[in-house]
């Protein structure tokens, strides 16, 4: 066959559908690859062709649109299953062509089984609700286009395995499920089962999503630096290891990027002539507030390093904060010698700080390792 623009296998769209339920799958060409829609293509005389490769097979074959009760059909740019079967799993290709033009894309379709409690290998979307925030709703997802607006389906909501009836703060309202006030105890998987009639048959659509109760924007604050702080002094002798943790608490904020970084003498550690290692760890609370810790480490600290300014910075959508660590050179304890007893004074006192290379004062032309 002549050349065809092949967009390959679009693994970004791992389409999963439940066995024995209707599924409508739009050809991804018009949504993600081409600059025109199906109507334009159709009126320009282009034809949309569907074929598939079964799971664990290499052979492309046409889709059988002559199955009993039109189990598989095509309508405009949509491939319909009424309903799916387990062995419909495979890679599906839609191709748009005429005598002079051709473009195609493949995508994987997985038909999955669920148990009586709606457990399955299906990847679940996560919906975040703010804790103790007032009325919030979730909506039964991906049911548009399955039935006309004249059809009134019945919708049943479940939390885990249990039908939602007479729950204190959770009220089913058709396609919506309302949380009068959300608590941590509302975390879990919620399923809506939509039942609708079509041509004398009854179909069910099952949609499960995970509800995660997160910190409320009402309680959100700018980042809080717990360490370094004014109560801890990092007192070291040259040659010792300097370890300074920067521990920052971030309130949960939807779509906020939380950042923590160190500066040394106002510069990125990479631009300072010392061997610095920075290791980061992140932990989350039950409401997804985040604590980030970045430990700055200098294996063998020098007198010059003990004069530098070590500042931990943090930023979120709520603001930016910074805190300097108090780093000092340990003053050697006086040696109690005979001279001291005789009144000549200690021999080992003083700050013990040699004069550093003046070029290191504010200069940073050397390089070091930064992990």
């Amino acid at each position: 066959s002549e050349r065809c623009d092949d967009w390959g296998l679009d693994t970004m769209r791992q389409i999963q559908v439940f066995e024995d339920e209707p599924a409508r799958i739009k050809c991804p060409l018009f949504e993600h690859f081409l600059k025109f829609n199906y109507s334009t293509a159709h009126s320009a005389g282009l034809t949309l062709i569907w074929y598939w490769t079964r799971q664990d097979r290499d052979l492309e074959e046409p889709i059988n649109f002559r199955l009993p009760e039109n189990r598989i059909s095509k309508e405009k740019d949509v491939l319909w299953f009424r309903p799916t079967l387990l062995n419909d799993t495979g890679n599906y290709t839609c191709m748009l062509r005429n005598t002079t033009y051709c473009s195609k894309v493949a995508f994987p379709l997985e038909v999955v089984q669920k148990d009586s409690c709606f457990n399955s290998p299906m990847k679940l979307p996560v919906h975040k609700l703010y804790i103790e925030y007032g009325i919030q709703r979730i909506t039964c997802p991906n049911v548009d286009g399955y039935f006309p607006s004249s059809v009134k389906p019945t919708i049943t909501w479940y939390m885990g395995c249990y039908k939602i009836q007479n729950f204190n703060n959770v009220i089913p309202e058709g396609m919506n499920l309302s949380f009068l006030i959300a608590f941590i105890s509302n975390n879990g998987n919620y399923t809506c089962v939509v039942t609708y009639p079509e041509n004398g048959r009854t179909f069910h659509l099952t949609r499960t999503l995970t509800v995660k109760v997160v910190g409320s924007p009402k309680n959100a604050v700018p980042p809080v630096i717990h360490s370094p702080n004014d109560h801890v002094v990092y007192e070291k002798e040259p040659g010792e290891e300097l370890l300074i943790p920067c521990t920052v608490y971030f309130s949960f904020l939807m779509d906020s990027r939380n950042e923590v970084w160190w500066t040394i003498d106002g510069k990125k550690p990479d631009d300072i002539p010392i061997d610095v290692t920075i290791n980061e760890s992140i932990s989350h609370s039950r409401t997804e507030d985040e604590t980030r810790t970045q430990i700055l480490s200098i294996k063998k600290v020098t007198s010059e390093d003990l004069k530098r300014s070590y500042v931990c910075h943090a930023r979120s959508a709520k603001g930016e904060v910074a805190k300097a660590a108090t780093v000092k050179q340990k003053v050697p304890a006086p040696r109690y010698t005979v001279e001291l007893a005789c009144g000549f004074g200690a021999t080992g006192g003083g700050s013990g700080k040699p004069i550093p290379n003046p070029l290191l004062g504010l200069d940073s032309t050397h390089h070091h390792h930064h992990h």
Partner: antibody, heavy 121, light 107 residues
Framework: EVQLQQSGAELVKPGASVRLSCTSS????????MHWVKQRTEQGLEWVGR????????QYAPNFQDKATITVDTSSNTVYLQLSSLTSEDTAVYYC??????????????WGQGTLVTVSP | DIQMTQTTSSLSASLGDRVTISCRAS??????LNWYQQKPDGTVKLLIY???TLHSGVPSRFSGSGSGTDYSLTISNLEPEDIATYYC?????????FGSGTKLEIK
């Protein structure tokens, strides 16, 4: 509240020396490098040098190596700038300042009100 | 030494205007640049450090940007109290150096 109080204006003769003072309050002077800059009339700022009050270690801009001496008296929270062999080129306002963060931070957040030095016969 | 050039020595603008003050370094200074404001009475304040970080207490109408050798300070909505001279300052290499200043006046 962080404050830097500088000494009053000085009128000095060419060839003489002058010592300017900068007394800090609201923070421990030992925790911050203290800096001086020079500003000639209608001109930009020129960094003179700095001192680590913890141990008295100093650093100067090359142009001021033989002109300026910075000292500190931690008991009175005061930093001094001594200028020697004065010429008309040294006529300027001199500012002391403190960084934003502990130690040798290069973000100069707190400034004194400036001291005018006039060198005139 | 790194030379900091503020080509516009004075600038006249109307209240409410958006004003941009520029500063050029004689070599790449890796964003290690601060901006200061000096009021007519000589008072000096840090406005922005590390190119774009607003110092606490500085109004959000001030912003900084730039990279490499070219940097700018923008005042989005000029207020009467913004009448001052603005200095850039690099701390990439020793010794730290300042621009010659841009004096901002009201039309």
């Amino acid at each position: 509240e962080v404050q830097l109080q500088q000494s009053g204006a000085e009128l000095v003769k060419p060839g003489a020396s002058v010592r300017l003072s900068c007394t800090s309050s609201g923070f421990n002077i030992k925790d911050y490098f203290m800096h001086w800059v020079k500003q000639r009339t209608e001109q930009g700022l020129e960094w003179v040098g700095r001192i680590d009050p913890e141990d008295g270690e100093t650093q100067y801009a090359p142009n001021f190596q033989d002109k300026a001496t910075i000292t500190v008296d931690t008991s009175s929270n005061t930093v001094y700038l001594q200028l020697s062999s004065l010429t008309s080129e040294d006529t300027a306002v001199y500012y002391c300042f403190r960084p934003l963060y502990y130690g040798n931070s290069p973000w100069f957040a707190y400034w004194g009100q400036g001291t005018l030095v006039t060198v005139s016969p | 030494d790194i030379q900091m050039t503020q080509t516009t020595s004075s600038l006249s603008a109307s209240l409410g205007d958006r004003v941009t003050i520029s500063c050029r370094a004689s070599q790449d200074i890796s964003n290690y640049l601060n901006w200061y404001q000096q009021k007519p009475d000589g008072t000096v304040k840090l406005l922005i450090y590390y190119t774009s970080t607003l110092h606490s207490g500085v109004p959000s109408r001030f912003s900084g940007s730039g990279s490499g050798t070219d940097y700018s300070l923008t005042i989005s909505n000029l207020e009467p109290e913004d009448i001052a001279t603005y200095y850039c300052h690099q701390y990439s290499k020793f010794p730290p150096t300042f621009g010659s200043g841009t004096k901002l006046e009201i039309k």
